[in-house]
């Protein structure tokens, strides 16, 4: 068995680090899937929702074959940082409707922060540049209405779910190339 959770890993084997990142990503994916289902149950979604400030999906079935580790990790970190900002915004701006999901949203934020720390560690171990590529940060304005914040929540959780789903596939594929 590996070291206890939370203890520093002595080994700097990138494959073991990737395994750890995949495990955290899978765990966050399960949380996101569960919360998205809870959202649909509490606040039925009328069709697909989008949010201009969310990152566009970085990976697709066509791009999986050409993935390179530095690019994937950098882009994944940038996208997840954007999702973290959106989850923080939801928790603050969502109003009473979304406060009913507060324990779960808080846990999701904590897991997302943990995964970002793990990715940062992995990138430093692989001597990859930490700086995120220059990208304009779109300020997140107030939701137009409570209904609007619910639509935004559907979009954020749906987008995060897709991003994490591709992240797991991409990281697993990259592990085989190490």
């Amino acid at each position: 068995p590996g070291p206890p959770a939370g203890s520093p890993r002595v080994s700097s084997d990138p494959r073991a680090d990737l395994d750890s990142a995949v495990l955290l990503t899978r765990s966050l994916l399960a949380d996101t899937r569960q919360l998205a289902a809870q959202m649909r149950d509490k606040f039925p979604a009328d069709g697909d929702h989008s949010l201009d400030s969310l990152p566009t999906l970085a990976m697709s079935a066509g791009t999986l074959g050409s993935l390179q580790l530095p690019g994937v990790l950098t882009r994944l970190r940038v996208d997840l940082m954007s999702y973290l900002r959106h989850v923080q915004w939801l928790r603050r701006a969502g109003g009473p409707s979304l406060k009913t999901l507060e324990p779960e949203l808080g846990a999701l934020q904590a897991r997302l922060e943990r995964l970002l720390r793990r990715l940062q560690l992995l990138m430093s171990r692989l001597a990859l540049p930490q700086a995120a590529p220059d990208q304009p940060v779109i300020p997140l304005g107030p939701p137009a209405s409570a209904w609007g914040s619910i639509r935004a929540a559907h979009a954020i959780l749906g987008g995060l779910h897709l991003t994490l789903d591709w992240a797991v596939r991409g990281l697993l594929l990259l592990k085989t190339r190490l």
Partner: antibody, heavy 117, light 110 residues
Framework: QVQLVESGGGVVQPGRSLRLSCAAS????????MHWVRQAPGKGLEWVAV????????FYADSVKGRFTISRDNSKNTLYLQMNSLRAEDTAVYYC??????????WGQGTLVTVSS | QSVLTQPPSASGTPGQRVTISCSGS????????VNWYQQLPGTAPKLLIY???LRPSGVPDRFSGSKSGTSASLAISGLRSEDEADYYC???????????FGGGTKLTVL
């Protein structure tokens, strides 16, 4: 333009009940969470209750929990506050307020409730 | 006693800059947006600042909001006689599951 008009206030004896209404117009009522806020004579603002846009989630201040009930009828664009077991300390101007998220962007003019024997 | 703490009164002369403080905790100001409301004598409150530091359309840029940790403040520059009113800070409180207000600050323009 957005309008919120409260009604139903008046003089009532301690222990009795009263129902306040807030008629909304000028916006899509069913898209907004709605609050009741009160202000005792010469005192500050006190939050009373909130109901989510579709009516399923409600939160109350400890001071009114178990006595007051917030509700809404989206087909009538109306918000309600059912006040039971009224006490002297419930005497106040009651305002309804609209919220797009974390702030009250529009307020009604208020309706005065006086609880006195 | 209010959950958010404001000075009961503040004053200034026309043209001056006045600041009103609002102190809270990690469960309200520390983790949620702060809003400020102005209540002119005999009228309903009006939104003045939301999202910590944003102004609704129609509110002069003489009014500004800021936040640091568990405290917030409202600044009014170029004070005018029509600014004489009660000012309230407010925020959602995660522990109480509700909105909390400051006790209000009565601003007098001397």
């Amino acid at each position: 333009q957005v309008q919120l008009v409260e009604s139903g206030g008046g003089v009532v004896q301690p222990g009795r009940s009263l129902r306040l209404s807030c008629a909304a117009s000028g916006f899509t009522f069913s898209h907004y969470d709605m609050h009741w806020v009160r202000q005792a004579p010469g005192k500050g603002l006190e939050w009373v209750a909130v109901i989510s846009y579709e009516g399923s989630n409600k939160f109350y201040a400890d001071s009114v929990k178990g006595r007051f009930t917030i509700s809404r009828d989206n087909s009538k664009n109306t918000l309600y506050l059912q006040m039971n077991s009224l006490r002297a300390e419930d005497t106040a101007v009651y305002y309804c307020a609209r919220t797009p998220g974390s702030h009250f962007d529009y307020w009604g003019q208020g309706t005065l409730v006086t609880v006195s024997s | 006693q209010s959950v958010l703490t404001q000075p009961p009164s503040a004053s200034g002369t026309p043209g001056q800059r006045v600041t009103i403080s609002c102190s809270g905790s990690s469960s309200n100001i520390g983790s949620n947006y702060v809003n400020w409301y102005q209540q002119l004598p005999g009228t309903a409150p009006k939104l003045l600042i939301y999202y910590d530091n944003l102004r609704p359309s129609g509110v002069p840029d003489r009014f500004s909001g800021s936040k640091s940790g568990t405290s917030a403040s409202l600044a009014i520059s170029g004070l005018r006689s029509e600014d004489e009113a009660d000012y309230y800070c407010a925020a959602w409180d995660d522990s109480l599951s509700g909105v909390v207000f400051g006790g209000g600050t009565k601003l007098t323009v001397l």
